[in-house]
């Protein structure tokens, strides 16, 4: 890379101290080597973010098992591949189990809490509310634009964006990806959704000056509110049945 930077992740420290003077970039907070030709995992990005801080309806009803990320930011533990470890704990020894997007899926417990596996989030529902426009967007054009966005910007294979629903002013983007469908070089829907979330908030993780530019037939799409629901391959294990909202 020119001047040795990581174009896909600004939360890195890069140098040419590697073999043959090749540019190598490590995620802040974890020092894990990242591949700058693709998206960095959400776990490493959250860790870097925390280290920086220290320093008919055509719309889908989310399933009763869908989880919203109410807990917000925390300093996660990532494995050597940059994925979330099944059990996460805070500094006061409060622990909980997470899914593959790092969202809590059990009640909180103490250090005796066991989390046998990282349960995969196979379905992500991104719900956006757009700013009022003179007239509603054409559904087909909106669908094409959002598919193009996820394919071009996040390099998500088109087959993993299963649907775009629209009922003015609400847009829903459905991402689906089973473990068996995800190839070695495929971008994970968890990472694509996180990059998109940060882009929407104007907090792009990409190095360049160029931010998100979503427009439908010349009409800009301005997002006022975002909700993201995560559906796991196994139901969450909360003591009370609930659909959280946050």
């Amino acid at each position: 890379q020119s001047n040795c930077t990581c174009p896909t992740n600004k939360m890195t420290v890069c140098d040419t101290n590697g073999p043959g003077g090749v540019c190598q970039c490590r995620a802040m907070g974890s020092q894990v080597l990242v591949d700058c030709s693709t998206l960095t995992s959400k776990c490493l990005l959250l860790k870097a973010r925390m280290s920086a801080r220290k320093s008919g309806r055509s719309l889908v009803m989310p399933s009763e098992h869908a989880i919203l990320d109410n807990d917000g930011l925390y300093d996660p533990e990532c494995d050597d591949k940059g994925r979330f470890k099944a059990r996460q704990c805070n500094q006061t020894s409060v622990c909980w189990c997470v899914n593959s997007v790092g969202v809590r899926r059990t009640d909180k417990g103490d250090q005796s809490l066991r989390c046998d596996e990282v349960v995969r989030t196979h379905h992500i529902l991104i719900e956006l509310r757009h700013r009022p426009t003179d007239r509603a967007f054409n559904h087909s054009d909106l669908d094409s634009e959002l598919r193009r966005l996820f394919q071009e910007r996040y390099k998500l294979h088109p087959s993993f964006l299963s649907a775009v629903h629209y009922e003015e002013p609400t847009i829903q983007i459905e991402l689906r990806q089973n473990a068996s469908q995800k190839g070695l070089r495929d971008v994970d829907i968890a990472d694509a959704a996180y990059y998109f979330e940060r882009d929407i908030k104007g907090e792009s993780l990409f190095m360049g000056r160029r931010g998100l530019d979503v427009q439908v037939r010349g009409e800009p799409l301005h997002v006022e509110r975002t909700l993201i629901y995560y559906l796991d391959e196994k139901p969450p294990q909360f003591s009370m049945k609930r659909l959280t909202a946050g």
Epitope: P7, T8, G208, R210, P220
Partner: antibody, heavy 126, light 106 residues
Framework: AVTLDESGGGLQTPGGGLSLVCKAS????????MFWVRQAPGKGLEWVAV????????NYAPAVKGRATISRDNGQSTLRLQLNNLRAEDTGTYYC???????????????????WGHGTEVIVSS | ALALTQPSSVSANPGETVKITCSGG???YGWFQQKSPGIAPVIVI????NRPSDIPSRFSGSKSGSTGTLTITGVQAEDEAVYFC???????????FGAGTTLTVL
Amino acid sequence: AVTLDESGGGLQTPGGGLSLVCKASGFDFIDYDMFWVRQAPGKGLEWVAVINRSGSYTNYAPAVKGRATISRDNGQSTLRLQLNNLRAEDTGTYYCARGACTHCWDADSAGYIDTWGHGTEVIVSS
Amino acid sequence: ALALTQPSSVSANPGETVKITCSGGSGSYGWFQQKSPGIAPVIVIFNDDNRPSDIPSRFSGSKSGSTGTLTITGVQAEDEAVYFCGGYDGSTDAGIFGAGTTLTVL
């Protein structure tokens, strides 16, 4: 057929200004980023400027920054390049080009150019 | 970077395979064929490995790490030209080209 037709070149005086126009046809102009690329006589290609679909984002090569303005009219499917304070080194053939990846984080890349115009020749001389 | 790095010249006999490399960029690469200066370049590859429909299948593109490669499998006399690579310079956040590689078919 996808075509890009440049015009506005010719003999220019040093210190003056020029306005190049590119007329696009055969595709939905509003859906694509657009570039200007130039080539000095006997030299290689030089990336000059880029503009995104809406015109809200522009970027320029260091050699023309502060002297160049890229703009577009989506209704008329036209791209413009205004270049002021002309120098002898601005001499060359100017090409209008289309970008194939408007959402990419590296969308300014010359690697996304998928269509060229025929070019218009600019000579800056007194 | 002032320019992407590519060899100044390569030569091959008809029917041989030619590889031209391009490095120094931090994004996607494209390859442009120019048979004479002042004549518009022809796009042979864009976005690393996309070949326009009117370009012969003997032309292919690939990328490994930050190096792009143009491969001409079974080079022909009419492929003799200057090949420019185009890419992205992360330090200036702008597009960039290589100085060109002259391909001579012996």
